[in-house]
């Protein structure tokens, strides 16, 4: 902490401007009014303060707002956000998507920090659910965001938000997460026609049950092998050779290259050899 010292004559700050970069830490503490700083936070980012000087400015805001900063200040924190601890952020009440975007912008291009994770958690909990606009914003900054949520957290995602999800947003999701997301996607896309529906639902099929895969096999969808390989093992096992052939269409030949890998291996092992032979791929059960 900076010692309390009187501000030298003529140095009292009347506005937040570039002259302050020449102030020593103790001078900033003594000569910058916290209330002035709070009202002119938007100017701080335009001034090349040192990290030590930013520490002083943060300390002044902490003193002014011991219960947590108001959103009017939070929205303009800019690089000062990087000085905040998760404990600081837990005191905030962030409700504006613009505020969230402004702070995510500061951390752009970096891994999700504990500060950002705490900020997002506070924001989403404040909203009560992960709505489409929020999801759009978060996945734009962090494509892996959705898959960083627990199945319990994902259960608060309304089906309408699923429209914001891009295939790459699901790349790192595990089976338990897809189990939660798939029914939501099925509901979100239920009014689409066959081919359009398949394009949209494809990325979520790792959570699909057997009966849905059987239904898809009747629709000439021509599922690619990459999608098939992500299906739930327990959903694939009951499929007949004929159903898998219909499901994959021309891609069925790809089974040969994947015969040693799950879930293809598990499925092959449980088929009658006579049925496998009808594929003409030389698969051995």
């Amino acid at each position: 902490e900076v010692e309390k010292t009187a501000c030298p004559s003529g140095k009292k700050a009347r506005e937040i401007d570039e002259s302050l970069i020449f102030y020593k830490k103790w001078e900033l503490e003594a000569c910058v009014d916290a209330a002035l700083l709070a009202t002119q936070m938007d100017r701080v980012n335009a001034i090349p303060f040192t990290y030590e000087q930013l520490d002083v400015l943060k300390h002044k805001l902490d003193e002014l707002y011991p219960q947590g900063y108001p959103e009017s200040v939070i929205q303009h924190l800019g690089y000062l956000f990087l000085k905040m601890s998760p404990e600081d952020i837990r005191k905030w009440n962030v409700t504006s998507l613009e505020t969230l975007k402004a702070l995510l912008e500061v951390n752009k291009g970096h891994e999700m920090s504990p500060q950002v994770a705490t900020l997002i958690d506070r924001f989403v909990k404040g909203r009560g659910q992960l709505d489409k606009d929020t999801l759009d914003t978060l996945t734009a900054f962090y494509p892996g965001y959705l898959c960083s949520l627990s199945p319990e957290e994902l259960s608060s995602v309304p089906p309408s938000s699923i429209w914001a999800v891009r295939p790459q947003d699901l790349d790192t999701c595990d089976p338990r997460q897809l189990d939660v997301l798939y029914p939501k996607a099925r509901l979100a896309f239920q009014n689409m026609n066959g081919s359009e529906y398949f394009v949209k639902i494809q990325s979520f099929l790792g959570g699909a049950p057997t009966e849905d895969l059987k239904a898809l096999s009747q629709q000439n969808v021509s599922m690619d092998l990459a999608t098939f390989m992500k299906l739930r093992t327990d959903a694939v096992l009951p499929l007949t050779v004929a159903e898998v052939q219909k499901l994959l269409g021309p891609h069925v030949e790809g089974l040969k290259a994947e015969e040693r890998h799950r879930p293809v291996r598990d499925w092959i092992l449980r088929q009658r050899q006579d049925d496998l032979d009808t594929l003409g791929l030389g698969l051995q059960g």
Partner: antibody, heavy 119, light 107 residues
Framework: QVQLQESGPGLVKPSETLSLTCTVS??????????WSWIRQPPGKGLEWIGY???????NYNPSLKSRVTISVDTSKNQFSLKLSSVTAADTAVYYC???????????WGQGTMVTVSS | DIQMTQSPSSLSASVGDRVTITCRAS??????LNWYQQKPGKAPKLLIY???SLQSGVPSRFSGSGSGTDFTLTISSLQPEDFATYYC?????????FGGGTKVEIK
């Protein structure tokens, strides 16, 4: 509750064949969802998968042991067996049988049996 | 064969510590990754399957994460009974392979 029990000689001479049997109790070796594996662990070392069998008789072996391994299943006795030929001292290990449940992993193990290869 | 590399090979920790063990596959194995715990003279015990699913009866302080090639086993608060050796194992390829093991010892 499925239980597995390994049985077989604890001492085998070099160049001979190691033979072990695993008896399945409380469940069926003919289960649709299960594969039956053999895994070994040399003293003070890590785990090495030897191979598995499905009740249909389909097998799959560790490539490094394939030329010497045979795993078979006897559904009438609810058992599966391991044969490892041309053994050397390097085959000295604790041998485990294990159930490989298709939706999880090796969820049930035998208690293991120590096999020493020595003349 | 798919190689599984575990790190560290051993670690010392105290009761209450958060412990993280990593496992890396030489190629993508999707989520087909299991974790086992083994105590001296005993058979291994399945802790986590499919990368992140907790096996029935296993305490919730154990958790797993990851997909593709990089996986993590975390013990949120180490208990006296958790001092053991931990192994990862891939079941994606038909030739199953285990990691070399991580021995968790008392500091």
């Amino acid at each position: 509750q499925v239980q597995l029990q390994e049985s077989g000689p604890g001492l085998v001479k070099p160049s001979e064949t190691l033979s072990l049997t695993c008896t399945v109790s409380g469940g069926s070796v003919s289960s649709y969802h299960d594969l039956w594996s053999w895994i070994r662990q040399p003293p003070g070392k890590g785990l090495e998968w030897i191979g598995y069998i499905y009740y249909s008789g389909s097998t799959n072996y560790n490539p490094s042991l394939k030329s010497r391994v045979t795993i078979s299943v006897d559904t009438s006795k609810n058992q599966f067996s391991l044969k490892l030929s041309s053994v050397t001292a390097a085959d000295t290990a604790v041998y485990y049988c294990a159930r490989d449940f298709v939706l999880s992993g090796f969820d049930i193990w035998g208690q293991g049996t120590m096999v020493t290869v020595s003349s | 064969d798919i190689q599984m590399t575990q790190s560290p090979s051993s670690l010392s920790a105290s009761v209450g510590d958060r412990v993280t063990i990593t496992c890396r596959a030489s190629q993508s194995i999707s989520s087909y990754l299991n974790w086992y715990q083994q105590k001296p003279g005993k058979a291994p015990k399945l802790l986590i399957y499919a990368a992140s699913s907790l096996q029935s009866g296993v305490p919730s302080r154990f958790s797993g994460s990851g997909s593709g090639t990089d996986f993590t086993l975390t013990i949120s608060s180490l208990q006296p009974e958790d001092f053991a050796t931990y192994y990862c194992q891939q079941s994606y390829d038909a030739s199953y392979t285990f990691g070399g093991g991580t021995k968790v010892e008392i500091k």
